[in-house]
Amino acid sequence: IFLSAFFTYVPMNEQIIIGRLGEDIILPSSFERGSEVVIHWKYQDSYNSYNVHSYYKGSGRLESQDTRYANRTSLFYNEIQNGNASLFFRRLSLLDEGIYTCYVGTAIQAITNKVVLKVGVFLTPMMKYEKRNTNSFLICNVLSVYPRPIITWKMDNTPISENNMQETGSLGPFSINSTLNITGSNSSYECTIENSLLKQTWTGRWTMKDGLHKMQSEHVSLSCELVNDYFSPNQDFKVTWSRMESGISSILAYYLSSSQNTTFYESRFSWNKELKNQSDFSMNLTDLSLSDSGEYLCNISSDEYTLLTIHTVHVEPSQETASDN
């Protein structure tokens, strides 16, 4: 009777914690300081309750810990006396998603804290431009994502439907390819992949420039600029210039913003301007020959964006060459 007069039970409160696959997380739980602290963390699914971590009589008690949590959980033992019952959780897997309940008892109080753990993953997606026979395709691809993302395609800023979507990984994480047939189009296209749990998005943008007609031995300038609504000066990105030929892409130049290093794989290729402001990556190709006709692709990519710019170059025989023939 004496005890019950001073013993209080605090009802359950709940919070949502979002973690990333493979990373560590803290499931928070606090209580009013007291003596004779007992802590039990449990995981509840539709059918059973599993012991995650226990503490009583001044030390961690793992005899009844479920094997899935072995070597993956710990408490902040030196902070328990200050009312910290939070659980440190290592190497999250998708199977760890669910409801965790922390029961804390002291000599004067019992509390229950509920934590809903959600786990997400979002590996950097990419946008690819492919030619198959006479058809052109844009592919937005994400290798590992959870939960299932929202994929948005836009043509000239208006949403459109994708042509084909392939998904693997029935329970997650998912690998997704979303394809759009853009044969014969000179519109601009955008693909956005959105993980609403992790509050992360990635956008790929594709732009086809007007065809360039040049004479043999002339030079051509191929434009490629960062658009002002995308990249910021402090963002790491890479720029790749390549040439598409018979469905195969060969790299002509490569630039890394972090090191500000450029590698040229074609001696006739050079930057139009000094890369001082790191926003204009236009290229010059000199001494054109007939075999330089084709599609040139500028790819600017960061963790958040891919910008693809396509140029079609037509090189025609010069007058002298034509008259020689």
């Epitope: 949403p159 998005t201 910021s232």
Partner: antibody, heavy 119, light 111 residues
Framework: QVQLQQSGAELAKPGASVKMSCKAS????????IHWIKQRPGQGLEWIGY????????EYNQKFKDKATFTADKSSSTAYMQLSSLTSEDSAVFYC????????????WGQGTTLTVSS | DIVLTQSPASLAVSLGLRATISCRSS??????????MHWYQQKPGQPPKLLIM???NLESGVPARFSGSGSGTDFTLNIHPVDEEDTATYYC?????????FGGGTKLEIK
């Protein structure tokens, strides 16, 4: 936790300008967009536009193009909206709201700044 | 601009029953994969709170009694079973093209 703290109520005269602020905390300011939304007393919501704090790129609803100007200060994680040539029609609650990059819905909102335009 | 019309303008629903709110757009705002319609709840003196994005995706932390559906021009927000704390005004919003617009709101009262 994510919070958008807006500046206090404003009382302004017709023809004047006001600048209200929206201070973000609990997330990386430059990784999201800040939208501004207007709500007149007893009426619905109107989207004014957004700013990308990372690059200072702005997009406006045509209706507000000559009325609103967005700026952002990355160092203080604060977005601003200036409203000019005020009339009684501008009396409203103005909200800032966070949006994911490339997604046009609003997952966190400020508490609102009440603007009263009166002579 | 795309006009969103919500109906009814107000409704009263008994505790524990279902509330259904409709939002009709003046043109289609969906593709074969996504509905570009989002739903918010606003209580008096508070800012709106996101409930559902892309027609049917529940925002993290929102109770499962809220659900959304629809495509094309017709979208629906369902609340079942309604709770006393659901007394609020509900707004739909599209993100199809600029400018993004909101519906006029539906005021829900719990009996």
């Amino acid at each position: 936790q994510v919070q958008l703290q807006q500046s206090g109520a404003e009382l302004a005269k017709p023809g004047a300008s006001v600048k209200m602020s929206c201070k973000a905390s609990g997330y990386t300011f430059t990784s999201f967009w800040i939208h501004w939304i207007k709500q007149r007393p007893g009426q619905g919501l109107e989207w004014i536009g957004y700013i990308i704090p990372n690059t200072d790129y702005t997009e406006y609803n045509q209706k507000f193009k000559d009325k609103a100007t967005f700026t952002a200060d990355k160092s203080s994680s604060t977005a601003y909206m200036q409203l000019s040539s005020l009339t009684s029609e501008d009396s409203a609650v103005f909200y800032c709201a966070r949006g994911l990059r490339g997604a046009y819905y609003f997952d966190y909102w400020g508490q609102g700044t009440t603007l009263t335009v009166s002579s | 601009d795309i006009v969103l019309t919500q109906s009814p303008a107000s409704l009263a629903v008994s505790l524990g029953l279902r509330a259904t709110i409709s939002c009709r757009s003046s043109q289609s705002v969906s593709t074969s994969t996504n509905g570009y319609m989002h739903w918010y709840q606003q209580k008096p003196g508070q800012p709106p709170k996101l409930l559902i994005m892309y027609a049917s995706n529940l925002e993290s932390g929102v109770p499962a009694r809220f659900s959304g559906s629809g495509s094309g021009t017709d979208f629906t927000l369902n609340i079942h079973p309604v709770d006393e704390e659901d007394t609020a005004t509900y707004y739909c919003q599209h993100s199809w093209v600029l400018p993004y617009t909101f519906g006029g709101g539906t005021k829900l009262e719990i009996k």
